[in-house]
Interface confidence: low
């Protein structure tokens, strides 16, 4: 299916609006520090060029690959060397090395100021004055902060962002209408970004076999009535889509995602009874809906798996003939029967089954050797079940903030070398698992919790890869994708760690503390907690609780005082001295 001009092909397939949006996202994800106006100029130039190619596919340069065209355009940025340093060296390379070079320089933690939300009236004026620029700015700001955001999904977020302003800027109480919608988009956006980052890490660090295994398990849970052949086709197509998006091929990715949505809606009967309501929606909404669709009901009376995968005398013959297909079928059959298991658990079971067959099919009596393979699954299943049970009990007992604090202490003791902002961010997000998953019925808790934790721990791995400081973190992040969470869970207090020297400056607070939002206050307190644990890794829960309670009381007292700053200046050193004494 070759085209004389790839850029013309994609422009015609996607339409001008989506084409321009995706090119803006691509450029913003590559050159994260460039000003908005610079990117808009580049996008307009690319769009005008694409239109000449639509008019005449034989026109000069229209036959060039998208990587060549986009890379050439990025390399025209005048300030590339000053702004990006060694990334400018990418421009000396030829494709495909140049694109690989750009990909390697994507920054998961760019040094960009946090987005400040202006007053509602200011935003509504900007929206009405120039809707197109307003929405482009949204794409640009999100994309540069989230360089792996799933591009076609970001277009869907932008459409919802536009709809929120269109509705709420006409409302009687604009703020009451708009702010909850913006909060929801922000939270969903962060979650979407983190989920996609795991997909890209899976593909880039562990290869497409790892991603395909994940997809087989997840799609088999979602579509338990679908044939293995059908699931395999969906997995192949989905892998192509995500490989493209993670590789910066955003036009191809969006085009292929649209094709996949079309295929699924045309073949609902052989996929799932749950797709109907998605398939009536417009493209962006439809694709989102299909990705989030609930699990279909499991077929009645599925026979036991043991017959084909344990009792059969042909297991080793079947395994030897087509290892990946046989293991894929095992994973499919197991996953469709277990919507109550996390995908990561299912992948561990498939890994354990594979290891058993590797060992047993070389043994004198293979059947005797693998006869008890399903019994070996029990401890693998019980470990996450127990973990979820214990942590949900703790969450229910403590509430979210204190549960986050317990995790902060736990993870700081495990990996105290990791930077304090990273430990605070990751532990706060780990703590959100409680509110997200513990309220769910038993059968949904494990898939919710463990697969969410995998996403959060991937963030730790991604940040740590940029600035590696802990061999333990490197080991857990790189040895096995499916065992990352159990690896981190198994880490104990790092006995080799030399405690951080006490720094009074770290525990010095000012009156500005009183004007912070509740969330910002929590982050300040949690930052202090991490620093305390780094100073005294062997401090007991009781000691830390005592210090944190004193801290809360000290802040509350000073924020009620008439002269807040004087109170902080006077009470702060007392708090520090008392804390040191309590932890001595």
């Amino acid at each position: 299916d070759t085209h004389k001009s790839e850029v013309a092909h994609r422009f015609k397939d996607l339409g001008e609006e989506h084409f321009k949006g995706l090119v803006l996202v691509a450029f913003s994800q590559y050159l994260q520090q460039c000003p908005f106006e610079e990117h808009v100029k580049l996008v307009n130039e690319v769009t005008e060029f694409a239109k000449t190619c639509v008019a005449d596919e034989s026109a000069e340069n229209c036959d060039k690959s998208l990587h060549t065209l986009f890379g050439d355009k990025l390399c025209t940025v005048a300030t590339l060397r000053e702004t990006y340093g060694e990334m400018a060296d990418c421009c000396a390379k030829q494709e495909p090395e140049r694109n690989e070079c750009f990909l390697q320089h994507k920054d998961d933690n760019p040094n960009l100021p946090p987005l400040v939300r202006p007053e509602v009236d200011v935003m509504c004026t900007a929206f009405h004055d120039n809707e197109a620029t307003f929405l482009k700015k949204y794409l640009y700001e999100v994309a540069r902060r989230h360089p792996y955001f799933y591009a076609p999904e970001l277009l869907f977020f932008a459409a919802r962002y536009k709809a929120a302003f269109a509705e709420c800027c006409q409302a009687a109480d604009k703020a009451a209408c708009l702010l909850p919608k913006l909060d929801e988009l922000r939270d969903e956006g962060k979650a979407s970004s983190a989920k996609q980052r795991l997909k890209c890490a899976s593909l880039q660090k562990f290869g497409d076999r790892a991603f395909k295994a994940w997809a087989v398990a997840r799609l088999s849970q979602k579509f338990p009535k679908a044939e293995f052949a059908e699931v395999s086709k969906l997995v192949t197509d989905l892998t192509k889509v995500h490989t493209e998006c993670c590789h910066g091929d955003l036009l191809e990715c969006a085009d292929d995602r649209a094709d996949l949505a079309k295929y699924m809606c045309e073949n609902q009967d052989s996929i799932s009874s749950k797709l109907k309501e998605c398939c009536d929606k417009p493209l962006l909404e439809k694709s989102h809906c299909l990705a989030e669709v609930e699990n279909d009901e499991m077929p009645a009376d599925l026979p036991s798996l043991a017959a084909d995968y344990v009792e059969s005398k042909d297991v080793c013959k079947n395994y030897a003939e087509a290892k990946d297909v046989f293991l894929g079928m095992f994973l499919y059959e197991y996953a469709r029967r277990h919507p109550d298991y996390s995908v990561m658990l299912l992948l561990r079971l498939a890994k354990a089954y594979e290891a058993t067959l590797e060992k047993c099919c070389a043994a004198a009596d293979p059947h005797e050797c693998y006869a008890k393979v399903f019994d070996e699954f029990q401890p693998l299943v019980e470990e996450p079940q127990n973990l979820v049970k214990q942590n949900c009990e703790l969450f229910e007992q403590l509430g979210e903030y204190k549960f986050q604090n317990a995790l902060l202490v736990r993870y700081t003791k495990k990996v105290p070398q990791v930077s304090t902002p990273t430990l605070v961010e990751v532990s706060r997000n780990l703590g959100k698992v409680g509110a997200k998953c513990c309220k769910l019925p038993e059968a949904k808790r494990m898939p919710c919790a463990e697969d969410y934790l995998s996403v959060v721990l991937n963030r730790l791995c991604v940040l740590h890869e940029k600035t590696p400081v802990s061999e333990k973190v490197t080991k857990c992040c790189t040895e096995s994708l499916v065992n990352r969470r159990p690896c981190f869970s198994a880490l104990e207090l790092d006995e080799a760690y030399v405690p951080k020297a006490f720094n009074a400056e770290t525990f010095t607070f000012h009156a500005d503390m009183c004007t912070l939002s509740e969330k910002e206050k929590q982050v300040k307190k949690q930052t202090a907690l991490v620093e305390l644990v780094k100073h005294k890794p062997k401090a007991t829960k009781e000691q830390l609780k005592g210090v944190m309670d004193n801290f809360a009381a000290f802040v509350e007292k000073c924020c009620k005082a008439d002269d807040k700053e004087a109170c902080f200046a006077e009470e702060g050193p007392k708090f520090v001295a008392a804390s040191q004494a309590a932890l001595a």
């Epitope: 009535k225 044939e227 077929p299 599925l302 084909d308 009792e311 079947n318």
Partner: nanobody
Framework: EVQLVESGGGLVQPGGSLRLSCAAS????????MSWVRQAPGKGPEWVSA????????RYAESIKGRFTISRDNAKKTLYLQMNSLKPEDTAVYYC????????GSQGTQVTVSS
């Protein structure tokens, strides 16, 4: 591309017999267990019978035990269902599937039992 093509269905009187065939292509037929599934008008799919890859282990739904026999010929890449003592309630479209799926991955073959 995986393809499964069923044949052998038709109209038969109660107590009669039929033999369904399923020709497979596009995958290593001999490596996979196979099943027969049926879907009666207005009802959901119902698993009927399964056979392991080597043809040694067979399983049947309670409703057809003793009347239907599943078999396979790996050399011919074909799955069979011998149906004896047919009853009106066996009327359905019959599908063959890879593994133990109860979804319709193929066109199926219509079996109608009526006097």
């Amino acid at each position: 591309e995986v393809q499964l093509v069923e044949s052998g269905g038709g109209l038969v009187q109660p107590g009669g017999s039929l033999r369904l065939s399923c020709a497979a292509s596009g995958f290593t037929f001999g490596s996979f267990g196979m099943s027969w599934v049926r879907q009666a008008p207005g009802k959901g799919p119902e698993w009927v019978s399964a056979i392991d890859s080597g043809g040694t282990d067979t399983r049947y739904a309670e409703s057809i035990k003793g009347r239907f026999t599943i078999s396979r010929d790996n050399a011919k890449k074909t799955l069979y269902l011998q149906m004896n003592s047919l009853k009106p309630e066996d009327t359905a479209v019959y599908y063959c599937t890879i593994g133990q799926s109860t979804s319709r991955g193929s066109q199926g073959t219509q079996v109608t039992v009526s006097s």
